[in-house]
Structure formats: C-alpha cells, structure tokens
C-alpha cells in the first residue's frame, strides 16, 4: 500500500533571465528512493539516481544544475520553460509517486511565489 | 573498458533447464540495473527481465514469469538468467545489457544461443 | 503493455542520402525512447537514448527528436557503415518494448 505523500513548491513563478529552484519531497512513507526523474511536459530533463548519481540531459545541460538535494535548479529562465514539471520518485517497496509543479515565467520583475500543496 | 560475456547457451530438449551467466566487468556492476533481452532466429529484440542493483525488485515479461528466475551476484560481478520449463519458442540468442538510470541499455553483450529441440 | 510501430520496416537508400525512420507508441512515453542499430551476428548497440541524446561515440549524422508518441530517428548523410537494422525501444514502463525494426539496405 502506498502511504506516502510528494510536497512540491506547488505553482511558482520566475523573473526572465532568473533562476528558479524545483522542489519535492517525499514523506509519509518508509519506501527506499532509488531515484528521481524530473521532466518538463514530454521531455526528461534529469535523474537523480541513488546508486549512478546525477544525470543531466545533454540538451539542458547549459540551463538546468543538480540540487540542492534532489530537486533541480533551472537558469537563464525564459519565457518558453512556463509550464508544468513533473518530480517522480520511484521506490522500493512502494512504487512510482509523482509531484506536481507549474512554474510561469514572467518579463516583469513582479514574481511571486505559490504556496506549497501536497499531492498524495 | 566495459565488457559483458555470456555463457551458459546450448541444445536442450523441451521441458528442460538451462541456467545463463553474464559476466560484467569494467563497471561498477553492483550500481546498475541489468537486464536480459532475446532475438529469435530472423526476428527482433524481446525484452525477457530486468533486476535493480540491490536485486530488490525483478520484472518479467509474461512469456517468461513463473519459469525464468532472474538474480545477480554482486559479489562475483555476475548476472544470471535460470530457465526452467523451455519450450520451442524460447529459442534465440539472449543477451545482457547495463542499463543506467533504468532508461537505456548502453552495453550488450555479445550473446549465448539456446536452442530448444527434441 | 505499450506497443511500438516502426515504419517502414525496409529501405532502400544510397550512400549520401537523409535516411529517416518513424516510431510510434501506443500511448505516450514522454521521452523515454531509445534508438539502437544491429548488424547481422552483432549485439544491438545503442544510438539516441531519451529521444533525442546522441550516446558517447556514436557518430552526429545520427539525431533523434519526438516525445509523446511519435518519434524520428534521422540519419543525416547515410555512410556505408550504417547498412544495418534499427529498433526502437520504450523504457516508460515495463515490460520493455521494441519495435519490429527496421532495415536498411543499399539501394
């Protein structure tokens, strides 16, 4: 039975040319991380594995950096990375949790941050 | 340099049992998820199990569960495939792969041929 | 389980030529596509992994794009060493899936 919970940064938003940290974290549960892939809609952008370490995709390398912890860290944010990010973390003995983020890039200076929401 | 060798393959009659080894080397063999995939004769790749790096989980594919058990020691930088019950249709060459980040299979090996006849 | 269209399963091209082969998936698989190429009595070896990252080694003639379900494997300039069969591969979910290949022969 899988009793644990994912809390995201939930809805964020960002200054163009900013940089915006990306954060899950699992509780409730005493499941065993293996890993963690992050990806942006359709495209996996990195895995935080428990064994190989970090794997950036080649073609965010420039853009995006490991952490803190497992979450990743986006820069040189433009208007094109608005949208939806996804966190899964796959488990042992539990299985797949999936969290949520959207992150809206803005021109003006004017970004305010979401309040944090769980997704059980 | 990362090296994968089968072994094990060989003519066995229906119903028998035949036990596959992949020797690993040139890697870290206990950080990395390993996995066997099968190519019929003339055919293409069927992916057979998979096993994390700590050996807590396995998969199989359903032409498979319930006679091929797959394991590892890490120990002796080894994986294995033991099939038991064979039939006709298991025929192939069967290779193992490393398979970082359980995404890609980057290294194969070159392959050990079961034949599966009377 | 997820299944894996390859089209078309034959060609013919001739050395120099812009090879493209489509892989299609039965449900979305984000960019969890892997591309690998196989010569006769040889291990597949991998080319293009996660859709469109070009694995250590292999040649940049070779690129892949697509997410989702529809996927491209492209061969920009064909050379006489890519005579051979490519499959592709989903790694969403397990079981693991490979398409039925495709193979490519000098016209």
């Known amino acids: 039975m899988m009793t644990g919970t994912i809390e995201t940064t939930g809805n964020i938003s960002a200054e163009k040319g900013g940089s915006i940290i990306l954060q899950c974290h699992l509780s409730s549960t005493t499941a065993q991380v293996t890993q963690v892939n992050w990806e942006q809609q359709d495209q996996l952008l990195a895995i935080c594995n428990a064994d190989l370490g970090w794997h950036i995709s080649p073609s965010f390398k420039d853009r995006v950096a490991p952490g803190p912890g497992l979450g990743l860290t986006l820069q040189s944010l433009t208007v094109n990375d608005t949208g939806e990010y996804f966190c899964i973390y796959h488990t042992y003995p539990d299985g797949t949790y999936t969290g949520r983020i959207f992150l809206e890039v803005l021109e003006s200076s004017v970004a305010e941050h979401g309040a944090r929401f769980q997704i059980p | 340099e990362v090296q994968l060798l089968e072994s094990g393959g060989g003519l066995v009659q229906p119903g028998g049992s035949l036990r596959l080894s992949c020797a690993a080397s040139g890697f870290t063999f206990s950080s990395y998820s390993m996995h066997w995939v099968r190519q019929a004769p003339g055919k293409g790749l069927e992916w057979v199990s998979s096993?994390?790096?700590?050996?807590?989980?396995?998969s199989y594919a359903d032409s498979v569960k319930g006679r091929f058990t797959i394991s590892r020691d890490n120990s002796k930088n080894t994986l294995y495939l033991q099939m038991n019950s064979l039939r006709a249709e298991d025929t192939a060459v069967y290779y193992c792969?490393?398979?970082?980040?359980?995404?890609?299979?980057?290294?194969w090996g070159q392959g050990t041929l079961v034949t599966v006849s009377s | 389980d997820i299944q894996m269209t390859q089209s078309p399963s034959s060609l013919s091209a001739s050395v120099g030529d812009r090879v493209t082969i489509t892989c299609r998936a039965s449900q979305s698989i984000s960019s969890y596509l892997n591309w690998y190429q196989q010569k006769p009595g040889k291990a597949p070896k991998l080319l293009i992994y996660?859709?469109?990252s070009l694995q250590s080694g292999v040649p940049s003639r070779f690129s892949g794009s697509g997410s989702g379900t529809d996927f491209t494997l492209t061969i920009s300039s064909l050379q006489p060493e890519d005579f051979a069969t490519y499959y592709c591969q989903q790694s969403y979910s397990t079981p693991l899936t490979f398409g039925g290949g495709t193979k490519v022969e000098i016209k």
């Open positions: 792969a490393r398979v970082p980040y359980d995404v890609w299979l980057d290294y």
């Open positions: 996660a859709a469109s």
């Open positions: 096993i994390s790096s700590s050996a807590g989980y396995t």
